[in-house]
């Protein structure tokens, strides 16, 4: 009961946790305007992975896409596709612990393999996890150096624009999003990895009761048939797996001197 | 057609208050950001106050903050400037004002305009 | 605050002559978010309540004769009229659109000689 229940809220969590790096990745406030030096600009601006935006005081609203693709910052390239392997590593994971779970029933699929696949999809969503985590990091040390950097008429902004006036970014939003989606994400790995252990099921020694008939002398030993209702335990030997999890290296992110905000 | 109107202008002593109302029709009122702009004896154009279309926020003349209080009323479609601790300086020629969407925070159309007076 | 300076404050000129009034901002109005510029200039007839003819530096507003334009960038703005005609006598107003509290320049009086 308590596997199926560690496995059931590992599937959520990591669930809610994809759906937070999705939305972390779509948003565009990964960067806002410091507001520290002029709190009452009739100008906003804030970027994301995508485009860039600017919202009047008058309520108007324009986002512009980065139709380029060798123009952008290499390290901006390098957080978007550390999103978009995480979503789909993600994505995978879910499909596989769709059918991993213990309360879902598919033919005659045994113990074994929905351990396996268990501990697939754990290690999947603690992959996919630190990539959202590494990503969002990446892109914070980037706005940590530039925000440092940035002084008048620098080249800033994802086009290489000139400025004239001095305009710093800091956090936004999507940044806060991906930081606790990658963490709940990595969560829910661990908790189906633990629930993988307990999946696994392990070589049950069942003693040999003998029952003497009478003018008979034949010992019926249970076990022997196997369990047509779905529900009884197998016997049979099985491997058990090792819920402890490998996960590649962290990704170590060095301060860039890419002028991106 | 595009109509601001304002209202509620008079003779005032100082240190007393008045409220200043901006009938709007001919656009939806609740979409736009709305301003107050006065116009000194001496014609020099002086911005007072602003507030954004659902009205959370507003913005204002550091001369007058504290003073006036810019408020709207969407169902009305109605601007309001409530202006109290008046000053003989707030003497002016005041405009309801209505800020373009796609006009780059320009005010593309204004009210024919409401006389303040500030006198003892 | 953004000091918007106005030159000449006052403009005689002969119609069908040119016009060109200078308007510079004491900070850029430039927005690097959007590349745009943002500073308006207005029309103001006696009488009457001041008029939108230009926004976002250049950029003229629907209904304002093609014989008004706006140019600039940063803090150095210019309003250009090609042939001024007798309609266009007023007082001519820049005003910053980037920064509280949005300021407007003194005024330049265009008069017909």
């Known amino acids: 009961m308590a596997v199926t229940a560690c496995q059931g809220l590992g599937f959520v969590v990591s669930l809610i946790g994809i759906a937070g790096i999705i939305a972390a990745t779509c948003m565009d406030q990964w960067s806002t305007q410091d507001l520290y030096n002029n709190p009452v600009t009739a100008v906003f601006n804030y970027q994301g992975l995508w485009r860039s935006c600017v919202r009047e005081s008058s309520g108007f609203t324009e986002c512009r896409g980065y139709f380029t693709l060798l123009g952008l910052p290499a390290m901006l390239q390098a957080v978007r596709a550390l999103m978009i392997v995480g979503i789909v590593l993600g994505a995978i994971g879910l499909l596989v612990s769709i059918f991993a779970l213990k309360c879902i029933r598919i033919g005659s699929m045994e113990d074994s393999a929905k351990a396996n696949m268990t501990l697939t999809s754990g290690i999947m969503f603690i992959v996919s996890g630190l990539c959202a985590i590494a990503g969002v990091s990446v892109f914070a040390n980037m706005l940590v150096t530039n925000f440092w950097m940035s002084t008048a008429n620098m080249y800033t902004g994802m086009g290489g624009m000139v400025q004239t006036v001095q305009t710093r970014y800091t956090f936004g939003a999507a940044l806060f999003v991906g930081w606790v989606a990658g963490g709940l994400t990595l969560i829910g790995g661990v908790m189906m990895c633990i629930a993988c252990r307990g999946l696994a099921p392990e070589e049950t020694n069942y003693k040999a009761v003998s029952y003497h008939a009478s003018g008979h002398s034949v010992a019926y030993k249970p076990g022997g048939f196997k369990a047509s209702t779905g529900f009884g335990s197998n016997t049979k030997n099985k491997k058990i797996y090792d819920g402890g999890a490998r996960t590649e290296d962290e990704v170590q992110s060095y301060p860039s001197k890419h002028d991106y905000v | 057609e595009v109509m601001l109107v304002e209202s509620g202008g008079g003779l005032v002593q100082p240190g007393g208050s008045l409220r200043l109302s901006c009938a709007a029709s001919?656009?939806?009122?609740?979409?736009?950001?709305m301003s107050w702009v006065r116009q000194t004896p001496e014609k020099r154009l002086e911005w007072v106050a602003t507030?954004?279309?659902?009205?959370?926020?507003?913005y204002y003349l550091d001369s007058v903050k504290g003073r006036f209080t810019i408020s709207r009323d969407n169902a009305k479609n109605t601007l309001y400037l409530q202006m109290n601790s008046l000053r003989a300086e707030d003497t002016a020629l005041y405009y309801c004002?209505?800020?373009?969407?796609?006009?780059?925070?320009?005010?593309?159309?204004w009210g024919q305009g409401t006389l303040i007076t500030v006198s003892s | 605050d953004i000091v918007m300076t106005q030159s000449p404050l006052s403009l005689p000129v002969t119609p069908g002559e040119p016009a060109s009034i200078s308007c510079k901002s004491s900070?850029?109005?430039?927005?690097?978010?959007?590349?745009?510029?943002?500073l308006a200039w207005y029309l103001q007839k006696p009488g009457q309540p001041p008029k939108l003819l230009i926004y976002?530096?250049?950029t003229r507003e629907s209904g304002v004769p093609d014989r008004f334009t706006g140019s600039g960038f940063g803090t150095d703005f210019t309003l250009k009229i090609s042939r001024v005609e007798a309609e266009d006598v007023g007082v001519y107003y820049c005003?910053?659109?980037?920064?509280?509290?949005?300021?407007f320049g003194a005024g330049t009086k265009l008069e017909i000689k």
């Open positions: 900070q850029s109005l430039f927005n690097s978010g959007n590349q745009k510029n943002y």
């Open positions: 507030i954004v279309g659902g009205g959370g926020y507003t």
């Open positions: 001919g656009f939806t009122f609740s979409t736009y950001t």
């Open positions: 976002g530096a250049s």
């Open positions: 004002a209505r800020m373009g969407l796609t006009q780059r925070n320009a005010l593309d159309y």
């Open positions: 005003q910053n659109d980037h920064t509280y509290p949005l300021t």
